[in-house]
């Protein structure tokens, strides 16, 4: 629970708690912003980001964005609040423990994004369809 000597709420800057009233601690994410990447045509890639940061807000999750255009490939790794869009997209998979890449429509480039909520989960980005929850076999495993 929130320690009694810690101010609970000031200037609408709430202390985030979980369902049991315990203080919610932030998670760790790879946080290299945008870097050039060699990740291409692979089932999964490591981020090759050497910076792990404590997210600024406890509600933030890890995000990875993979982009490919005519000139280069980049990988972006950050923390982000799933209540807010990122690159104009909702983080619909924010509760996932793994960063499963989903393609998004962006003109002029190939654009994949994933989000996840376990420590450093955006270090390993997964493109393979076998991890995708749209796969009926995986859904069967999840709900058994």
């Amino acid at each position: 629970t929130i320690p009694p000597h810690v101010q609970k709420s000031v200037n609408n800057d709430m202390i985030v708690t979980d369902n049991n009233g315990a203080v919610k601690f932030p998670q760790l994410c790879k946080f290299c912003d945008v870097r050039f990447s060699t990740c291409d045509n692979q089932k999964s890639c490591m981020s090759n980001c050497s910076i792990t940061s404590i997210c600024e807000k406890p509600q933030e999750v890890c995000v990875a964005v993979w982009r490919k255009n005519d000139e280069n490939i980049t990988l972006e790794t950050v923390c982000h609040d799933p209540k807010l869009p990122y690159h104009d997209f909702i983080l619909e998979d924010a509760a996932s423990p793994k960063c499963i890449m989903k393609e998004k429509k962006k003109p002029g480039e190939t654009f994949f994004m994933c989000s996840c909520s376990s420590d450093e989960c955006n270090d390993n980005i997964i493109f393979s369809e076998e991890y995708n929850t749209s796969n009926p076999d995986l859904l069967l495993v999840i709900f058994q």
């Epitope: 979980d18 049991n20 315990a22 203080v23 601690f25 760790l28 404590i54």
Partner: nanobody, 122 residues
Framework: EVQLLESGGGLVQPGGSLRLSCAAS???????QMWWVRQAPGKGLEFIS?????????YYANSVKGRFTISRDNSKNTLYLQMNSLRAEDTAVYYC???????????????WGQGTLVTVSS
């Protein structure tokens, strides 16, 4: 009974240094994940540094990276925060906290010290 007692706070000029300590008792200190968390006047909690056990891996918030260093001495049951290149925006009450999984996925017990005030001002 778990106890965490912070010390080392005070008034320091911008650019100066301070070393905070957190004396722990009532639990096996060497096996616990420990944090430094701060609360600036009129603000929410900011989780600035974490040190794991075993292994002692350390992590920092972007706001303090390169300026603050977390460490622990398991033989003395003490957690430290070395703060260099202090800025006015580092003014806050600094708490040490310990966090341990309950055994139920995604839930934790946490314990907090009473805090020590750091004021950075000329």
């Amino acid at each position: 009974e778990v106890q965490l007692l912070e010390s080392g706070g005070g008034l320091v000029q911008p650019g100066g240094s301070l070393r905070l300590s957190c004396a722990a008792s009532g639990f096996t200190f060497g096996t616990e994940q420990m944090w430094w968390v701060r609360q600036a006047p009129g603000k929410g909690l900011e989780f600035i540094s974490r040190i794991d056990s075993p292994g002692g891996r350390t992590y920092y918030a972007n706001s303090v990276k390169g300026r603050f260093t977390i460490s622990r001495d398991n033989s003395k049951n003490t957690l430290y925060l070395q703060m260099n290149s202090l800025r006015a925006e580092d003014t806050a009450v600094y708490y040490c906290a310990k966090r341990r999984p309950t055994g139920v996925s995604g839930t934790f017990y946490d314990y907090w010290g009473q805090g020590t005030l750091v004021t950075v001002s000329s």
